[in-house]
Amino acid sequence: APELLGGPSVFLFPPKPKDTLMISRTPEVTCVVVDVSHEDPEVKFNWYVDGVEVHNAKTKPREEQYNSTYRVVSVLTVLHQDWLNGKEYKCKVSNKALGAPIEKTISKAK
Protein backbone atom coordinates (compact mmCIF):
# COMPACT_ATOMS: atom_id res chain seq x y z
CA ALA A 1 0.00 0.00 0.00
CA PRO A 2 1.23 3.53 -0.73
CA GLU A 3 2.92 5.26 2.20
CA LEU A 4 1.73 8.67 1.01
CA LEU A 5 1.33 11.09 3.86
CA GLY A 6 -0.19 14.53 3.37
CA GLY A 7 0.63 14.63 -0.32
CA PRO A 8 -1.43 15.42 -3.39
CA SER A 9 -4.24 13.18 -4.60
CA VAL A 10 -5.04 12.41 -8.24
CA PHE A 11 -8.46 11.79 -9.78
CA LEU A 12 -9.10 10.74 -13.36
CA PHE A 13 -12.48 11.45 -14.96
CA PRO A 14 -13.97 9.96 -18.14
CA PRO A 15 -15.46 11.97 -20.99
CA LYS A 16 -19.11 12.96 -20.76
CA PRO A 17 -21.14 10.16 -22.40
CA LYS A 18 -22.82 12.63 -24.76
CA ASP A 19 -19.38 13.83 -25.97
CA THR A 20 -18.33 10.31 -26.92
CA LEU A 21 -21.47 9.58 -28.90
CA MET A 22 -21.80 12.78 -30.94
CA ILE A 23 -19.18 13.33 -33.61
CA SER A 24 -19.65 17.10 -33.37
CA ARG A 25 -18.48 17.09 -29.74
CA THR A 26 -14.99 16.72 -28.26
CA PRO A 27 -14.55 13.96 -25.68
CA GLU A 28 -11.94 14.65 -22.99
CA VAL A 29 -10.32 12.65 -20.20
CA THR A 30 -9.56 14.91 -17.24
CA CYS A 31 -6.79 14.41 -14.69
CA VAL A 32 -7.24 16.48 -11.52
CA VAL A 33 -4.56 16.87 -8.85
CA VAL A 34 -5.71 18.29 -5.53
CA ASP A 35 -3.92 19.20 -2.31
CA VAL A 36 -0.88 20.52 -4.16
CA SER A 37 1.15 22.48 -1.62
CA HIS A 38 2.52 25.99 -2.14
CA GLU A 39 5.98 24.43 -1.79
CA ASP A 40 5.39 22.27 -4.87
CA PRO A 41 5.94 24.83 -7.61
CA GLU A 42 5.32 22.53 -10.54
CA VAL A 43 3.36 19.41 -11.32
CA LYS A 44 4.32 17.39 -14.37
CA PHE A 45 1.74 15.36 -16.29
CA ASN A 46 2.48 12.43 -18.59
CA TRP A 47 -0.33 10.85 -20.57
CA TYR A 48 -0.41 7.36 -22.10
CA VAL A 49 -2.91 5.71 -24.42
CA ASP A 50 -2.65 1.92 -24.26
CA GLY A 51 0.82 2.36 -22.80
CA VAL A 52 2.09 4.73 -25.50
CA GLU A 53 2.93 8.26 -24.38
CA VAL A 54 0.98 11.06 -26.07
CA HIS A 55 1.74 14.77 -25.97
CA ASN A 56 -1.46 16.57 -26.93
CA ALA A 57 -2.81 17.21 -23.42
CA LYS A 58 -3.46 20.74 -22.18
CA THR A 59 -2.61 21.70 -18.60
CA LYS A 60 -4.67 24.53 -17.16
CA PRO A 61 -3.28 27.24 -14.87
CA ARG A 62 -3.31 26.07 -11.27
CA GLU A 63 -6.16 27.29 -9.07
CA GLU A 64 -5.86 28.16 -5.41
CA GLN A 65 -8.32 26.33 -3.17
CA TYR A 66 -9.98 27.53 0.02
CA ASN A 67 -7.69 25.37 2.17
CA SER A 68 -4.53 27.15 0.91
CA THR A 69 -3.56 24.34 -1.46
CA TYR A 70 -3.70 24.26 -5.23
CA ARG A 71 -5.67 22.26 -7.75
CA VAL A 72 -4.10 21.47 -11.12
CA VAL A 73 -5.99 20.06 -14.10
CA SER A 74 -4.72 18.44 -17.28
CA VAL A 75 -7.12 17.58 -20.09
CA LEU A 76 -6.52 15.05 -22.86
CA THR A 77 -8.70 15.16 -25.94
CA VAL A 78 -9.51 11.60 -27.04
CA LEU A 79 -10.77 10.11 -30.27
CA HIS A 80 -14.41 9.02 -30.09
CA GLN A 81 -13.62 5.59 -31.52
CA ASP A 82 -10.63 5.02 -29.23
CA TRP A 83 -12.74 5.61 -26.14
CA LEU A 84 -15.67 3.55 -27.38
CA ASN A 85 -13.29 0.69 -28.31
CA GLY A 86 -12.04 0.52 -24.74
CA LYS A 87 -8.56 2.00 -25.06
CA GLU A 88 -6.84 2.63 -21.73
CA TYR A 89 -5.85 6.16 -20.67
CA LYS A 90 -3.24 6.74 -18.02
CA CYS A 91 -2.34 10.00 -16.30
CA LYS A 92 0.99 10.06 -14.45
CA VAL A 93 1.68 12.92 -12.04
CA SER A 94 5.18 13.69 -10.80
CA ASN A 95 7.44 16.32 -9.35
CA LYS A 96 10.55 16.45 -7.20
CA ALA A 97 8.57 15.92 -4.00
CA LEU A 98 6.88 12.76 -5.29
CA GLY A 99 9.35 9.93 -4.94
CA ALA A 100 6.74 7.57 -6.30
CA PRO A 101 4.86 9.21 -9.20
CA ILE A 102 1.09 8.85 -8.92
CA GLU A 103 -0.60 7.00 -11.77
CA LYS A 104 -4.30 6.65 -12.52
CA THR A 105 -5.83 4.66 -15.36
CA ILE A 106 -9.29 4.78 -16.89
CA SER A 107 -11.15 3.20 -19.79
CA LYS A 108 -14.72 2.73 -20.92
CA ALA A 109 -16.46 0.20 -18.69
CA LYS A 110 -16.78 -3.13 -20.50
Partner: antibody
Protein backbone atom coordinates in the same frame (compact mmCIF):
# COMPACT_ATOMS: atom_id res chain seq x y z
CA UNK B 1 10.83 -2.32 6.52
CA UNK B 2 12.75 -0.66 3.67
CA UNK B 3 16.09 -2.36 3.10
CA UNK B 4 18.77 -1.39 0.61
CA UNK B 5 21.96 -3.46 0.32
CA UNK B 6 24.81 -2.34 -1.92
CA UNK B 7 27.46 -4.70 -3.28
CA UNK B 8 30.15 -4.90 -5.94
CA UNK B 9 32.71 -2.52 -4.47
CA UNK B 10 36.41 -3.29 -4.27
CA UNK B 11 39.86 -2.30 -5.45
CA UNK B 12 40.19 -1.35 -9.10
CA UNK B 13 43.03 0.19 -11.11
CA UNK B 14 42.74 3.65 -12.69
CA UNK B 15 41.03 3.35 -16.05
CA UNK B 16 39.21 0.22 -14.94
CA UNK B 17 35.50 -0.55 -14.63
CA UNK B 18 33.21 -1.73 -11.87
CA UNK B 19 29.50 -2.48 -11.61
CA UNK B 20 27.73 -1.84 -8.32
CA UNK B 21 24.38 -3.34 -7.36
CA UNK B 22 21.72 -2.32 -4.87
CA UNK B 23 19.25 -4.99 -3.77
CA UNK B 24 15.96 -3.53 -2.53
CA UNK B 25 13.37 -5.16 -0.30
CA UNK B 26 10.49 -4.25 2.00
CA UNK B 27 8.73 -1.99 -0.53
CA UNK B 28 7.40 -1.97 -4.08
CA UNK B 29 10.65 -1.16 -5.85
CA UNK B 30 9.03 -0.54 -9.24
CA UNK B 31 7.08 2.48 -7.92
CA UNK B 32 10.05 4.60 -6.86
CA UNK B 33 12.74 6.81 -8.27
CA UNK B 34 16.15 5.62 -7.03
CA UNK B 35 19.42 7.46 -6.42
CA UNK B 36 23.14 6.79 -6.16
CA UNK B 37 25.11 9.04 -3.79
CA UNK B 38 28.80 8.77 -2.87
CA UNK B 39 31.04 9.95 -0.05
CA UNK B 40 34.81 10.19 -0.49
CA UNK B 41 36.88 9.37 2.60
CA UNK B 42 36.60 12.21 5.11
CA UNK B 43 34.47 14.28 2.71
CA UNK B 44 30.82 15.23 2.27
CA UNK B 45 28.11 13.71 0.10
CA UNK B 46 28.08 13.90 -3.69
CA UNK B 47 25.01 12.99 -5.71
CA UNK B 48 25.82 10.61 -8.57
CA UNK B 49 22.48 10.24 -10.33
CA UNK B 50 18.89 9.04 -10.29
CA UNK B 51 16.52 6.92 -12.35
CA UNK B 52 12.73 6.96 -12.77
CA UNK B 53 10.63 3.91 -11.86
CA UNK B 54 10.29 2.90 -15.51
CA UNK B 55 13.88 3.89 -16.50
CA UNK B 56 12.49 6.49 -18.93
CA UNK B 57 14.58 9.29 -17.43
CA UNK B 58 18.06 9.05 -15.94
CA UNK B 59 19.77 12.14 -14.56
CA UNK B 60 23.47 12.34 -13.72
CA UNK B 61 25.76 14.74 -11.91
CA UNK B 62 27.21 16.90 -14.71
CA UNK B 63 30.78 16.00 -13.72
CA UNK B 64 30.12 12.24 -14.04
CA UNK B 65 28.01 12.10 -17.20
CA UNK B 66 29.53 9.84 -19.82
CA UNK B 67 31.55 7.64 -17.47
CA UNK B 68 28.79 6.35 -15.20
CA UNK B 69 25.58 4.58 -16.23
CA UNK B 70 22.60 3.92 -13.97
CA UNK B 71 20.11 1.17 -14.72
CA UNK B 72 17.55 -0.94 -12.90
CA UNK B 73 15.78 -4.27 -13.16
CA UNK B 74 12.36 -4.04 -11.52
CA UNK B 75 11.80 -7.78 -11.87
CA UNK B 76 14.89 -8.36 -9.72
CA UNK B 77 14.28 -5.39 -7.36
CA UNK B 78 17.76 -4.19 -8.24
CA UNK B 79 19.50 -0.92 -9.05
CA UNK B 80 22.88 -0.78 -10.80
CA UNK B 81 25.74 1.64 -11.31
CA UNK B 82 28.20 0.88 -14.10
CA UNK B 83 31.40 2.88 -13.62
CA UNK B 84 33.94 3.15 -16.44
CA UNK B 85 37.28 4.96 -16.85
CA UNK B 86 37.66 5.11 -13.10
CA UNK B 87 39.96 7.69 -11.52
CA UNK B 88 41.54 8.02 -8.09
CA UNK B 89 38.99 10.74 -7.25
CA UNK B 90 36.17 8.20 -7.68
CA UNK B 91 37.37 6.46 -4.51
CA UNK B 92 34.37 6.63 -2.16
CA UNK B 93 31.64 4.74 -0.39
CA UNK B 94 28.71 4.44 -2.80
CA UNK B 95 25.15 4.43 -1.43
CA UNK B 96 21.78 3.83 -3.00
CA UNK B 97 18.98 5.95 -1.59
CA UNK B 98 15.23 5.86 -2.01
CA UNK B 99 12.79 8.76 -1.74
CA UNK B 100 9.75 8.78 0.48
CA UNK B 101 6.42 8.85 -1.37
CA UNK B 102 6.09 12.56 -0.73
CA UNK B 103 8.78 14.90 0.52
CA UNK B 104 12.21 13.52 1.35
CA UNK B 105 14.09 12.51 -1.81
CA UNK B 106 16.87 10.81 0.15
CA UNK B 107 14.77 9.14 2.84
CA UNK B 108 16.16 5.60 3.09
CA UNK B 109 19.80 4.63 2.60
CA UNK B 110 21.83 1.47 2.27
CA UNK B 111 24.97 0.74 4.26
CA UNK B 112 27.20 1.54 1.27
CA UNK B 113 29.93 -0.26 -0.66
CA UNK B 114 33.52 0.99 -0.80
CA UNK B 115 35.20 1.55 -4.16
CA UNK B 116 38.96 2.14 -4.10
CA UNK B 117 40.67 3.27 -7.30
CA UNK B 118 44.41 2.82 -6.96
CA UNK B 119 47.37 1.29 -8.74
CA UNK C 1 27.75 23.67 -11.62
CA UNK C 2 26.10 25.37 -8.66
CA UNK C 3 27.85 25.37 -5.30
CA UNK C 4 25.79 24.78 -2.16
CA UNK C 5 27.25 26.22 1.04
CA UNK C 6 26.51 25.29 4.66
CA UNK C 7 27.98 26.41 7.99
CA UNK C 8 30.89 24.01 8.64
CA UNK C 9 29.98 23.66 12.34
CA UNK C 10 27.43 24.88 14.86
CA UNK C 11 26.91 24.29 18.57
CA UNK C 12 23.63 24.25 20.47
CA UNK C 13 22.83 23.69 24.13
CA UNK C 14 20.51 20.82 25.11
CA UNK C 15 16.96 22.13 24.87
CA UNK C 16 18.11 25.09 22.78
CA UNK C 17 17.23 26.16 19.24
CA UNK C 18 19.57 26.32 16.28
CA UNK C 19 19.09 27.07 12.58
CA UNK C 20 21.26 25.49 9.89
CA UNK C 21 21.25 27.18 6.50
CA UNK C 22 21.92 26.21 2.93
CA UNK C 23 22.98 28.85 0.39
CA UNK C 24 23.04 28.51 -3.40
CA UNK C 25 25.73 30.15 -5.54
CA UNK C 26 23.11 30.79 -8.23
CA UNK C 27 20.99 33.14 -6.10
CA UNK C 28 18.06 32.79 -3.74
CA UNK C 29 16.91 29.29 -2.90
CA UNK C 30 13.26 28.85 -3.90
CA UNK C 31 10.66 26.10 -3.64
CA UNK C 32 11.83 24.96 -7.11
CA UNK C 33 15.06 23.77 -5.46
CA UNK C 34 13.06 21.24 -3.37
CA UNK C 35 15.50 21.55 -0.45
CA UNK C 36 16.26 18.27 1.31
CA UNK C 37 18.00 17.69 4.63
CA UNK C 38 19.88 14.48 5.47
CA UNK C 39 21.30 13.50 8.85
CA UNK C 40 24.50 11.45 9.15
CA UNK C 41 25.12 9.69 12.44
CA UNK C 42 28.37 7.83 13.36
CA UNK C 43 29.23 4.77 11.23
CA UNK C 44 27.76 6.43 8.14
CA UNK C 45 24.14 5.98 9.08
CA UNK C 46 22.12 8.32 6.86
CA UNK C 47 18.49 9.34 7.29
CA UNK C 48 16.42 11.74 5.22
CA UNK C 49 14.77 14.25 7.55
CA UNK C 50 13.02 16.73 5.28
CA UNK C 51 12.28 17.14 1.58
CA UNK C 52 10.37 19.51 -0.67
CA UNK C 53 11.55 22.45 1.50
CA UNK C 54 9.39 21.67 4.54
CA UNK C 55 7.93 18.15 4.42
CA UNK C 56 9.05 15.96 7.30
CA UNK C 57 9.81 12.34 6.48
CA UNK C 58 8.01 9.69 8.57
CA UNK C 59 9.92 9.25 11.78
CA UNK C 60 11.44 12.72 11.73
CA UNK C 61 10.81 14.29 15.14
CA UNK C 62 8.61 17.39 15.15
CA UNK C 63 11.50 19.40 16.63
CA UNK C 64 13.00 19.49 13.11
CA UNK C 65 11.42 21.90 10.63
CA UNK C 66 12.37 23.09 7.17
CA UNK C 67 11.77 26.50 5.62
CA UNK C 68 13.12 29.23 3.36
CA UNK C 69 14.78 32.05 5.24
CA UNK C 70 16.35 35.13 3.67
CA UNK C 71 16.98 33.46 0.32
CA UNK C 72 18.40 30.30 1.89
CA UNK C 73 16.99 26.92 2.82
CA UNK C 74 16.90 26.45 6.57
CA UNK C 75 16.64 23.55 8.99
CA UNK C 76 15.55 24.63 12.46
CA UNK C 77 16.00 22.37 15.45
CA UNK C 78 13.90 23.47 18.42
CA UNK C 79 14.60 21.74 21.71
CA UNK C 80 17.85 20.05 20.80
CA UNK C 81 18.51 16.57 22.22
CA UNK C 82 21.92 14.92 22.75
CA UNK C 83 21.03 12.39 20.03
CA UNK C 84 20.72 15.24 17.51
CA UNK C 85 24.50 15.61 17.48
CA UNK C 86 25.35 14.65 13.91
CA UNK C 87 26.41 15.90 10.49
CA UNK C 88 23.60 17.53 8.49
CA UNK C 89 23.62 17.85 4.71
CA UNK C 90 21.30 19.86 2.52
CA UNK C 91 20.66 19.03 -1.13
CA UNK C 92 19.19 21.39 -3.73
CA UNK C 93 17.62 20.51 -7.08
CA UNK C 94 18.78 22.38 -10.21
CA UNK C 95 16.46 21.42 -13.11
CA UNK C 96 18.10 18.06 -13.82
CA UNK C 97 20.52 17.30 -10.99
CA UNK C 98 20.95 17.51 -7.23
CA UNK C 99 23.83 19.25 -5.46
CA UNK C 100 24.73 18.53 -1.84
CA UNK C 101 26.19 21.10 0.49
CA UNK C 102 29.42 20.40 2.35
CA UNK C 103 27.58 19.54 5.55
CA UNK C 104 27.25 21.10 9.01
CA UNK C 105 28.68 19.36 12.04
CA UNK C 106 26.18 20.03 14.84
CA UNK C 107 27.42 19.66 18.41
CA UNK C 108 24.95 19.48 21.29
CA UNK C 109 26.89 20.74 24.28
Amino acid sequence: EVQLVESGGGLVQPGGSLRLSCAASGFTFSRYWMNWVRQAPGKGLEWVGEITPDSSTINYAPSLKGRFTISRDNAKNSLYLQMNSLRAEDTAVYYCARPYDYGAWFASWGQGTLVTVSS
Amino acid sequence: QAVVTQEPSLTVSPGGTVTLTCRSSTGAVTTSNYANWVQEKPDHLFTGLIGGTNKRAPGTPARFSGSLLGGKAALTLSGAQPEDEAEYYCALWYSNHWVFGGGTKLTVL
